[in-house]
C-alpha cells in the first residue's frame, strides 16, 4: 500500500460482491434461520426487558420484634432444685445488632455469682490432672476459662483439676436445655420496614404502603405483601422445625427481592419475600453447631464486683435486600439490537458450510459414486465454483505447463534441481473454459482467412505418427523442433520443455499458431489496441512483438490470466517466435517470475 494517500482515497467505499443462489432448499434454510433467530431475539427482548437500563437497589431496613415469653427455669438453691417462673419481654430476648440483622434469644445457660479469684477448672479432658506436673503456671489454654497457677487441686470428690485465676465458679461445660427455655418465641412477630431507592431513575418507595392493615400476618399465598412475620412461619417455609433450632440457635435469612419495572405503561414495584436457612444444620458437635454467644450482667455485692454470665442461644435473622429497577432506554435497545445482528449471519455460515462440505473431494470420490440419493447434492460443486475463486500463492517456484496432447494443464510448484521441466510430473489442473468473446477483438482477417491447402490444422496434431526428430533436437524433445537452451547451467532446466508429452507433430506447425502467435498483422493490431498511437523503431518493435507473441501463446494455451502469468513456453514455440521477431544483438533473457 502506498505510504501517502490522496484526498480521493479517503472518499471511497468498499463493498462485497455477492453470489445469489436461486435455490428452494437454501432459501428455505435461510428463512428458517432468520425466523427462528428473529423470534428468539424478540422473545428475549421482551421477557428479559433488555430494552431497559437496569440499576441495583439501595436499601435501608428497620425491624421491630414483638411478643412475650414465660420461662420456667430450674435452679439449685442450697442443694435443692427449684422451678422459677419468669416473664421475658422484647428488652430481655433481643439484642442490638449491626446492619440488617436482629437477634431473638431462644435458650440460655446461666452461671450466677461469679467473682475474680482462684478456683479449680471445670473437669474436662484438658483440665483433669493427677499431679502438679499436669498443670503449668501461667498457662492459658484457648479452651480454658483462666490462667493456670501450676497447682493440681481437688474439684469435687476424688476429681482433681488444674487451679486457675478466673471468674469463679467456672462456667460448667453442659448441653443447652431441652426443650428450649424460650420455645414460645415461635409465636413472636417481627415487623420489617424496608425503604428502597433507585437514584439513577430518581425513584423511591417502601414495602409498607399507606393503606396497609397493620394487624395482618404474612402468608405466602393469602397475604404475600404483609410485612409482619411470625417467626414459626418463617421456619415452616424453609422446612425446619422452630423447636429444634431454638435449642442450639441458628441463622435465618429473610430475602426481600425487588424486581421493579419503572416504565409508565407497565409500572410495577412491589417486594417478594422468601426465606433461607443460612447456618449449617448438619454441623458436627465438635464444630460448634447453632448460634450462641456469652454476655454478662455485672453488679456489686459487699463492695465486691460480681457478674452473672449468660450463654445465650438464639436465632439471628439476616435481612437480605436485593433486586433491580429497570426503565426504558433507547441506548440499551440499540446496543441489544446491535449485539443480535450478528446472529442473522448464522444462516450464511451454515449454508456455506453445506456448500463447502458437499463440494469436497471426499464427497465427490467416496459418497456420490455409491449413494444415489446424494446425487442431487452434486449441484453444490457448481455453486462452489461460482462462489469461490482459488488462487495459488505466487511463489518464485510456481510454473504452469501445457502439452498439446493433454487435456489438462500441469502446475509445477517446486524447484527443478537440475531436472528438465519436461520430466517433472507436477499437479494436474483443469484447463479454464475458453471465453470465445475474446476472439471478437481480433482483426477480421484472422476470422476470414480461408484454410491454406496442404497446411495441417491444430486438430491434426493429434495424429499418431511422430515427426522425425532432428539431429540437433535435445533428448527431452518430443516434436523434433526444440533447440537447446542458451541460458546458464543453473537456469537451463526451466527451458527444457517441449510442446508435447509424447512424440508427435509440433504445435508450431499448426495454422492457428501461425495466425494467432506469428502473424505480425495480428500482433501489431493487439499492440495498437493497447496503445493506439504507438510508433516504434524496428528493434524495439521486434522486442514488443516478440513479447506480445509470447503473451498471445500463453493466453491461447492457458486461458486464465493468472496461469498465463506463470506459463512456461515450450522450447519449440519460444525459438519459433524468436526466429520470427529476432533480437539484433545479445542473448535472450528467458522466463522471469512476474512477482
Amino acid at each position: 500500500m502506498p505510504a501517502c494517500c490522496s484526498c480521493s482515497d479517503v472518499f471511497q467505499y468498499e463493498t462485497n460482491k455477492v453470489t445469489r443462489i436461486q435455490s428452494m432448499n437454501y432459501g428455505t434454510i435461510k428463512w428458517f434461520f432468520h425466523v427462528i433467530i428473529f423470534s428468539y431475539v424478540c422473545f428475549a427482548l421482551v421477557s428479559d426487558k433488555l430494552y431497559q437500563r437496569k440499576e441495583p437497589v439501595i436499601s435501608s431496613v428497620h425491624t421491630k420484634v414483638k411478643g412475650i415469653a414465660e420461662v420456667k427455669e430450674e435452679i439449685v438453691e442450697n442443694g435443692v432444685k427449684k422451678l422459677v417462673h419468669s416473664v421475658f419481654d422484647t428488652a430481655d430476648y433481643t439484642f442490638p445488632l449491626q446492619g440488617n440483622s436482629f437477634f431473638v434469644m431462644t435458650n440460655f445457660l446461666k452461671t450466677e455469682g461469679q467473682e475474680q479469684r482462684l478456683c479449680p477448672e471445670y473437669p474436662t479432658r484438658r483440665t483433669l490432672c493427677s499431679s502438679d506436673r499436669g498443670c503449668k503456671k501461667g498457662w492459658m489454654d484457648p479452651q480454658s476459662k483462666g490462667i493456670q497457677t501450676g497447682r493440681c487441686v481437688v474439684y469435687e470428690g476424688n476429681q482433681k483439676t488444674c487451679e486457675v485465676s478466673a471468674w469463679c465458679p467456672i462456667e460448667a461445660v453442659e448441653e443447652a436445655p431441652r426443650p428450649a427455655l424460650l420455645n414460645s418465641a415461635e409465636n413472636f412477630t417481627v415487623l420489617i420496614k424496608n425503604n428502597i431507592d433507585f437514584p439513577g431513575h430518581n425513584y423511591t418507595t417502601r414495602n409498607i404502603l399507606p393503606g396497609l392493615n397493620i394487624t395482618c400476618t404474612f402468608h405466602k399465598t393469602q397475604n404475600p405483601q404483609c410485612p409482619i412475620f411470625r417467626l414459626g412461619d418463617i421456619f415452616r417455609e424453609t422446612g425446619d422445625n422452630f423447636s429444634d433450632v431454638a435449642i442450639q440457635g441458628g441463622i435465618m435469612g429473610i430475602e426481600i427481592y425487588w424486581d421493579c419495572n419503572l416504565d409508565r405503561w407497565f409500572h410495577h414495584c412491589r417486594p417478594k419475600y422468601s426465606f433461607r436457612r443460612l447456618d449449617d444444620k448438619t454441623t458436627n458437635v465438635s464444630l460448634y453447631p447453632g448460634y450462641n454467644f456469652r454476655y454478662a450482667k455485672y453488679y456489686k455485692e459487699n463492695n465486691v464486683e460480681k457478674r452473672t454470665l449468660i450463654k445465650v442461644f438464639g436465632i439471628r435473622f439476616d435481612i437480605l435486600v436485593f433486586g433491580t429497577g429497570g426503565k426504558f432506554d433507547i441506548i440499551q435497545l440499540v446496543v441489544y439490537i446491535g449485539s443480535t445482528l450478528s446472529y442473522f449471519g448464522l444462516a450464511a455460515v451454515f449454508i456455506d458450510f453445506l456448500i463447502d462440505t458437499y463440494s469436497s473431494n471426499c464427497c465427490r470420490s467416496h459418497i456420490y459414486p455409491w449413494c444415489k440419493c446424494c446425487q442431487p447434492c452434486v449441484v453444490n460443486e457448481y455453486y462452489y465454483r461460482k462462489k469461490c475463486e482459488s488462487i495459488v500463492e505466487p511463489k518464485p517456484t510456481l510454473k504452469y505447463v501445457s502439452f498439446v496432447d493433454e487435456s489438462h494443464i500441469r502446475m509445477v510448484n517446486q524447484q527443478l534441481l537440475g531436472r528438465s521441466l519436461q520430466d517433472v510430473k507436477g499437479q494436474e489442473v483443469p484447463r479454464p473454459a475458453m471465453d470465445f468473446t475474446d476472439l471478437s477483438r481480433l482483426p477480421l482477417a484472422l476470422h476470414d482467412t480461408p484454410p491454406i491447402p496442404g497446411q495441417p490444422e491444430e486438430i491434426q496434431l493429434l495424429r499418431k505418427e511422430a515427426t522425425p526428430r532432428s539431429r540437433d533436437s535435445p533428448v527431452w524433445c518430443q516434436c523434433g523442433s526444440c533447440l537447446p537452451s542458451q541460458l546458464p547451467e543453473s537456469h537451463r532446466c526451466l527451458e527444457e520443455l517441449c510442446c508435447r508429452k509424447k512424440p508427435g507433430a509440433c504445435i508450431t506447425t499448426s495454422e492457428l499458431f501461425r495466425k494467432l502467435v506469428l502473424s505480425r498483422h495480428v500482433l501489431q493490431f493487439l499492440l495498437l489496441y493497447q496503445e493506439p498511437l504507438l510508433a516504434l523503431d524496428v528493434d524495439s518493435t521486434n522486442s514488443r512483438l516478440r513479447h506480445c507473441a509470447y503473451r498471445c501463446y500463453a493466453t491461447w494455451r492457458f486461458g486464465s490470466q493468472d496461469m498465463a502469468d506463470f506459463a512456461i513456453l515450450p522450447s519449440c514455440c519460444r525459438w519459433r517466435i524468436r526466429k520470427e521477431f529476432p533480437k539484433s544483438e545479445g542473448q535472450y533473457s528467458g522466463f522471469k517470475s512476474p512477482y
Epitope: L128, C129, S130, P142, Q143, S286
Partner: nanobody, 129 residues
C-alpha cells in the same frame, strides 16, 4: 474413631530388651498424640512414654534413658523400644491415643491419662530370671 491393638509382650530376663508395638486403625492417625501407660497388679496406671502428632516426646521418670518411643505414620504404628529391663517393669502395657485435630496437646500434658480418649486392651510384659 480409632482402634488400638498392642503386641510384642512376653517374658524377658532382667537387663534384656523387648519391642512393643501399637497398631492403630483409622485414616487420621497422624492427627493423634500416642502414649504408652502401664499398670502393675494392685497399682495405679502409670505413664511410660508419649509422642505428639508433630513428634515431640515425653517419658516417665522411671524409664528415662532406657525406653524409646517413635511413630510410623505410613504404617499407623507406634513402637516402644524397651532396653535394660528391670523386674519392676513387669506390668500390663497399654497404648493410648489423644485427638489433636482441634488443637495440640501441650507437652506438659502428654503424661496425663485424662488427655487420652482411646485405649487398647493391653499386652503383658514380665521381667523375671
Amino acid at each position: 474413631e480409632v482402634q488400638l491393638v498392642e503386641s510384642g509382650g512376653g517374658v524377658v530376663q532382667p537387663g534384656g530388651s523387648l519391642r512393643l508395638s501399637c497398631a492403630a486403625s483409622g485414616r487420621t492417625f497422624r492427627h493423634y498424640a500416642m502414649g504408652w501407660f502401664r499398670q502393675a497388679p494392685g497399682k495405679e496406671r502409670e505413664f511410660v512414654a508419649a509422642i505428639s502428632s508433630y513428634g515431640s516426646t515425653d517419658y516417665g521418670d522411671s524409664v528415662k534413658g532406657r525406653f524409646t518411643i517413635s511413630r510410623d505414620d505410613a504404617k499407623n504404628t507406634v513402637p516402644l523400644q524397651m532396653n535394660s529391663l528391670k523386674p519392676e517393669d513387669t506390668a500390663l502395657y497399654y497404648c493410648a491415643a489423644a485427638d489433636e485435630t482441634l488443637g495440640a496437646v501441650p507437652n506438659f500434658r502428654l503424661h496425663e491419662k485424662y488427655e487420652y480418649e482411646y485405649w487398647g486392651q493391653g499386652t503383658l510384659v514380665q521381667v523375671s530370671s
